[in-house]
């Protein structure tokens, strides 16, 4: 079974978030993908790709760059010059129309804090390099213990189709999702 886990990423202001979302090639290679932020009950689409061509081109919307690799089943997301107000829950989705999106695993919980140095985002340290396992003192770029239950609101009267290998789980009128913390 596919685990739905919220992955926590902790950054300083000025750094760059870099993630990837994978999808089932045979289903979604030709679909548009989007990067969205959960804001209250409604997800807000921040950027979306064009329909893929033979040579995919990055799509840039402000500080966000999306690059789809339809031949590989991967979407690359980069968010540069992170700010405290960027903190929140993000998801990659297969973009159909606002009321129906296929959520790609895993939701990303982004936490951005003020940098301790006077020059956040300097070229030497613009991307967080700590991605060790949670057992170390460094913040891990991956699932960390948040809380066993995190409430995530979905759009009212909408259907979220969660893609899992070989099946689809239709969650209608989702009011909360149990997130299982992963330990190393």
């Amino acid at each position: 079974t596919t685990e739905l886990t919220e992955e926590k990423y902790e950054y300083k202001e000025g750094q760059t978030l870099e993630v990837k979302c994978d999808y089932a090639l045979e289903k979604y290679a030709n679909s548009r993908k989007a990067w969205q932020k959960m804001e209250g009950k409604m997800p807000k689409i921040l950027a979306k790709t064009e329909r893929p061509s033979e040579n995919s081109h990055p799509v840039q919307v402000g500080r966000i760059t999306l690059e789809d690799y339809p031949d590989h089943g991967l979407l690359q997301v980069r968010m540069t010059n992170l700010q405290v107000e960027d903190s929140g829950l993000y998801q990659c989705v297969i973009y159909q129309h606002p009321k129906e999106s296929h959520v790609l695993f895993n939701p990303i919980c982004l936490v951005v804090t003020k940098g301790s140095s006077g020059t956040p985002g300097s070229s030497e340290n613009s991307t967080q390099n700590v991605y060790r396992t949670p057992s170390t003192t460094a913040k891990a770029l991956g699932p960390r213990y948040t809380s066993p239950r995190t409430v995530t609101q979905a759009p009212p009267e909408s259907t979220v189709v969660v893609s899992t290998p070989g099946s689809e789980i239709n969650l209608t009128n989702v009011t909360d999702i149990i997130r299982v913390p992963v330990f190393n």
């Epitope: 596919t2 685990e3 886990t5 992955e7 870099e18 993630v19 990837k20 979302c21 994978d22 999808y23 089932a24 090639l25 690059e67 690799y69 590989h72 089943g73 991967l74 690359q76 997301v77 980069r78 695993f105 895993n106 990303i108 991307t127 390099n129 991605y131 396992t133 891990a140 770029l141 991956g142 699932p143 893609s163 899992t164 290998p165 070989g166 992963v182 330990f183 190393n184």
Partner: antibody, heavy 123, light 107 residues
Framework: QVQLVQSGAEVKKPGASVKVSCKAS????????INWVRQATGQGLEWMGW????????GSVKKFRDRVTMTRNTSISTAYMELSSLRSEDTAVYYC????????????????WGQGTLVTVSS | DIQMTQSPSSLSASVGDRVTITCQAS??????LNWYQQKPGKAPKLQIY???NLETGVPSRFSGSGSGTDFTFTISSLQPEDIATYYC?????????FGQGTRLEIK
């Protein structure tokens, strides 16, 4: 500690298929992508593709796309790479590799390697 | 695809020497570059990630630098156990590609 243990050496005839297994231990199998890298004798390293053990999704480079299948069995923390329609130039050591960062991180740094499986294709 | 060109393809140095290997990308890859060490008959080992970060357990005589298209891997004082082939690898985009390798021998 993290360990990736691969299946033993194989000798195959041209046109046949080979399935290499990679058993993971020492970490949460579904949290990290497994990649496959091969190395022909005396040659360099060649990335074949990746698989997310959680979603089961995978992708491979064009060169192998029609011939390679990457699967997993999460209950036994094992990844598999099957290569079909073998030819002599597929003779190589095949490595399964775990990335340094979690599956959602764009961190393609190959941190933990299996011991390698030598596949010999000969008539 | 991004091509990674390593130079030299082989080099011979004495114990205690400072050794430098370079890797050039066919286009800007920012800092998305790793270095590996491979000893005969063994699997490669990650040495440097993100161009300049030393992997845990790797001796401090190893270092990496560079960004954009030009990268350098340095061994400040060559030891007998450093005899191996070294590979660079980019991950700026897909597909991931490796350099052709640099074989390091003791004089």
């Amino acid at each position: 500690q993290v360990q990736l243990v691969q299946s033993g050496a194989e000798v195959k005839k041209p046109g046949a298929s080979v399935k290499v297994s990679c058993k993971a231990s020492g970490y949460t199998f579904t949290s990290y992508d497994i990649n496959w890298v091969r190395q022909a004798t005396g040659q360099g390293l060649e990335w074949m593709g990746w698989m997310n053990p959680n979603s089961g999704n995978s992708g491979s480079v064009k060169k192998f796309r029609d011939r390679v299948t990457m699967t997993r069995n999460t209950s036994i923390s094992t990844a598999y790479m099957e290569l079909s329609s073998l030819r002599s130039e597929d003779t190589a050591v095949y490595y399964c590799v775990r990335l340094i960062g979690y599956s959602s991180a764009w961190k393609w740094s190959f941190q933990h390697w299996g011991q390698g499986t030598l596949v010999t294709v000969s008539s | 695809d991004i091509q990674m060109t390593q130079s030299p393809s082989s080099l011979s140095a004495s114990v205690g020497d400072r050794v430098t290997i370079t890797c050039q990308a066919s286009r800007d890859i920012s800092k998305y570059l790793n270095w590996y060490q491979q000893k005969p008959g063994k699997a490669p080992k990650l040495q440097i990630y993100d161009a300049s970060n030393l992997e845990t357990g790797v001796p401090s005589r190893f270092s990496g630098s560079g960004s954009g298209t030009d990268f350098t891997f340095t061994i400040s004082s060559l030891q007998p156990e450093d005899i191996a082939t070294y590979y660079c690898q980019h991950y700026d985009n897909i597909p991931i590609t490796f350099g052709q390798g640099t074989r390091l021998e003791i004089k």
